[in-house]
């Protein structure tokens, strides 16, 4: 996302269509308080950032309120009055949805339905990953609403689950960010567990009749 202008690298993250974070890495200005100036309308004057991020005592980014889904962010990073990086970007390219909230599990025999609160905007994928200690890799299933049913589970095994939200690539482009994962929750026989054993426990011997 960054640019080669005077060695300034930038990163933009649009958190949940609400807040934009622009961070910069400028080796040439590593001990300088660069200032961030922005506008959402190309006709307006630039405003200066009022919520800077600091790294080692120097400005390294800015957080902006931006609850305007379709808009463009025009910005300029300056050393005094001298612009060192100027750009304008469609903010939705850098969308990062918020982490799933109110995650719930509903068990029925060998299947579980994972639900959570849908976000207020669309064109998202809700991904559930799960594994048991017997699995070498996470399994994954995703739907376009937060209502994901996973079938074919073994009721005797302990499964770990976590959930995240991703922006659909066909809509938002390929350079968005997935949400942070929800907390891992562990389940066995339809009941929540503190954790799943790292090493699989051997199956119980069957009692002969």
């Amino acid at each position: 996302q960054g640019g080669a202008a005077e060695g300034v690298q930038i990163q933009i993250i649009y958190f949940n269509l609400e807040t934009v974070q622009v961070t910069w890495n400028a080796s040439k200005y590593s001990r300088t308080n660069l200032t961030f100036h922005y506008r959402f309308n190309g006709d307006e004057a630039y405003d200066q950032c009022t919520n800077y991020l600091l790294q080692e005592g120097h400005t390294s980014g800015c957080l902006l309120d931006a609850e305007q889904r379709d808009d463009i962010l025009y910005f300029s990073i300056r050393n005094g009055t001298h612009p060192v990086f100027t750009a304008s970007r469609w903010m939705v390219y850098y969308l990062k949805p918020s982490s799933p909230k109110h995650v719930r599990f509903s068990w029925h025999q060998d299947a579980v339905t994972v639900t959570c609160s849908d976000l207020s905007y669309g064109d998202l994928l809700y991904e559930v990953q799960y594994r048991s200690p017997f699995d070498t890799e996470w399994q994954s299933k995703q739907e376009n609403t937060c209502n994901v049913t996973i079938e074919g589970l073994d009721a005797e095994k302990c499964y770990s689950f976590w959930v995240r939200v991703k922006a659909m690539e066909d809509v938002y482009g390929p350079d968005t960010y997935p949400s942070d994962w929800s907390e891992v929750t562990c389940w066995q026989r339809g009941e929540i567990r503190d954790a799943c054993a790292e090493t699989p426990t051997p199956p119980k011997p069957k009692l002969s009749k």
Epitope: Q1, G3, D70, W90, V92, Y93, G173, P174
Partner: antibody, heavy 122, light 107 residues
């Protein structure tokens, strides 16, 4: 399959105005998620994006042209329009209308009209 | 605005050979780079979206790669109908901008 047909091009005097039309068929211009754009191509073959109008009627314009152009649409006629004022010789170009990929204003353009030539000369 | 620079301006290649066209962005654009083909008297046609994603109906000999500021369009085995002008376009920057084009001609 969307088809786009531009019209309204021709010879215009410097300082004059033009209104180009783009008739869409096979697809509604109000379909959610799609944006419609005007792009022009100069005689030297360079391409310039001029502006968008969205399914929601929201418009965006190239800052270099913003003071001189207006993009509008007529849903009943399933058509888009480009109004351009204060024309100069350097506005001589082939003018295309095009549709963005689903997902909106921000992407590539997957359907184009055949273009209409505008010549600005006295 | 983001400046797109294509090279070379003209590329001469024999039919059946491989062609490699380059596009450079003045700022990093991730993978939001698109390629078009234009033949004389026709409108541009979208070939590749988002640097490497294929478009329905476009022959498999067309492929794209790259991210950040450096991008490449490769035509694996040139057919007679591939001789045309090719443009790249970036989309995350506002306004969207195109390269000046590479003319692919028969050697």
């Amino acid at each position: 399959q969307v088809q786009l047909v531009e019209s309204g091009g021709g010879l215009v005097k410097p300082g004059g105005s033009l209104r180009l039309s783009c008739a869409a068929s096979g697809f509604s211009i109000t379909t959610s998620g799609y944006y419609w754009t005007w792009i022009r191509q100069f005689p030297g073959k360079g391409l310039e994006w001029m502006g968008y109008i969205g399914y929601n009627s929201k418009t965006y314009y190239n800052p270099a042209l913003k003071s001189r152009i207006t993009i509008s649409r007529d849903n009943a006629k399933n058509s888009l329009y480009l109004q351009m004022n204060s024309l100069r010789a350097e506005d001589t170009a082939v003018y295309y209308c095009a549709r963005s990929l689903y997902g909106g204003y921000k992407d590539a353009f997957d359907s184009w009209g055949q273009g209409t030539l505008v010549t600005v000369s006295s | 605005e983001i400046v797109m620079t294509q090279s070379p301006a003209t590329l001469s290649v024999s039919p059946g050979e491989r062609a490699t066209l380059s596009c450079r962005a003045s700022q990093s654009i991730g993978t939001s780079l698109h390629w078009y083909q234009q033949k004389p008297g026709q409108a541009p046609r979208l070939l590749i979206k988002f640097a490497s994603r294929s478009i329905t109906g476009i022959p498999a000999r067309f492929s794209g790669s790259g991210s950040g500021t450096e991008f490449t369009l490769t035509i694996s085995s040139l057919q007679s109908e591939d001789f045309a002008v090719y443009y790249c376009q970036q989309s995350p920057g506002f306004p969207p901008t195109f390269g000046q084009g590479t003319k692919l001609e028969i050697k």
